[in-house]
Amino acid sequence: NFMYSKTVKRLSKLQEYQQYYPSLTCVMEGKDMEDWSCCPTPWTSFQSSCYFISTVMQSWTKSQNNCSVMGADLVVINTKEEQDFITQNLKINSAYFLGLSDPKGWRHWQWVDQTPYNKNVTFWHSGEPNSPDERCAIINFRSEEWGWNDVHCHVPQKSICKMKKIYI
């Protein structure tokens, strides 16, 4: 009976999400493998988040709006491990917008989800950021490593969206 009611709840939750995400990829998690954590297909998952790499070239504001429509934000990178996971799926000759910007050009960087900007957990390339006119951040491959660079927000780039996993 307990299992039946849980399955019914899950199905109704899945139906609820189906209007936003036609397909979900779920894995069993938790102590008793009773919880399911899901990401929209074909998003990838790492820890408690889902990631989507958009190859559409758009400005930073349009990229953020595009993520927002999908219930996500441009990616906020919190750890080196997270960055290493993300970069596995990126092309080395491309650049991707992050959810990091400095709209006033005062070098007051801010994450789109209001996560405090911690200078100690940043992965800027050497010499970056280097221009108050370049108010949006990308991740790209340079000098044999992935790192961040400040760029002009209005110039179209690819982007990475991030959302919390869906638990059912």
């Epitope: 758009q58 504001t61 953020q64 050009g105 221009s131 006119d133 002009h152 209005h154 179209p156």
Partner: antibody, heavy 121, light 111 residues
Framework: EVQLVESGGGLVKPGGSLRLSCAAS????????MSWVRQAPGKRLEWVAT????????YYPDSVKGRFTISRDNAKNSLYLQMNSLRAEDTAVYYC??????????????WGQGTTVTVSS | DIVLTQSPASLAVSPGQRATITCRAS??????????MHWYQQKPGQPPKLLIY???NLESGVPARFSGSGSGTDFTLTINPVEAEDTANYYC?????????FGGGTKVEIK
């Protein structure tokens, strides 16, 4: 006083080349992004090229990509536009404009008087 | 590319009256309260001159009779009261994404 003075325009045959110059004064030239904007007779303004302050980025619309090259010499306070493979539709007044960044975009706060380019056989 | 449509194409106004020019963008040029639409005045034989930046900010040295408003896709430039020297073409421009684009212009004539 901010001043932008263009030169180098003239009459050229289709397929020909021309190099426009813009001499800047009255401000720290190396600190600003610069653009070329053109205006064909009786038409709307059209952006042609942009170069960032540090010379690290150049941007062009598809209509001129591969034919026009924007460059700058910060030591000489000068902006240039090399125009190759010119077409009749490139006929216009070419303005040099200074960019001022605002939030996620920018606007053109100072413009030169313009130099006329005529492409005709 | 973002297309900017200005209306009317031309208008004739008596001195002391109000002139209103609108600019409609094919998609939003606003983001979190910042409106990346700008207005320029161009007199015959002269280069464009910046009047208003970011929808409503008056450029230094521009008379207070010029004002701008709007958000999203719809923006307005108002001249009130119009003076004889305001005879010119007026252009809107967006900069939220490349390429920066301009409206087709509105010709303002003083009756």
């Amino acid at each position: 006083e901010v001043q932008l003075v263009e030169s180098g325009g003239g009459l050229v045959k289709p397929g020909g080349s021309l190099r426009l110059s813009c001499a800047a004064s009255g401000f720290t030239f190396s600190s600003y992004g610069m653009s070329w904007v053109r205006q064909a007779p009786g038409k709307r303004l059209e952006w042609v090229a942009t170069i960032s302050s540090g010379d690290s980025y150049t941007y062009y619309p598809d209509s001129v990509k591969g034919r026009f090259t924007i460059s700058r010499d910060n030591a000489k306070n000068s902006l240039y536009l090399q125009m190759n493979s010119l077409r009749a539709e490139d006929t216009a007044v070419y303005y040099c404009a200074r960019q001022l960044y605002y939030s996620y975009g920018y606007y053109f706060d100072y413009w030169g008087q313009g130099t006329t380019v005529t492409v005709s056989s | 590319d973002i297309v900017l449509t200005q209306s009317p194409a031309s208008l004739a106004v008596s001195p002391g009256q109000r002139a209103t020019i609108t600019c409609r963008a094919s998609e939003s040029v606003s983001f979190h309260g910042t409106h990346l639409m700008h207005w320029y005045q161009q007199k015959p034989g002269q280069p464009p001159k910046l009047l208003i930046y970011a929808a409503s900010n008056l450029e230094s040295g521009v008379p207070a009779r010029f004002s701008g408003s709007g958000s999203g896709t719809d923006f307005t430039l108002t001249i009130n009261p119009v003076e004889a020297e305001d005879t010119a073409n007026y252009y809107c421009q967006q900069s939220i994404e490349d390429p920066p684009t301009f409206g087709g212009g509105t010709k303002v004539e003083i009756k």
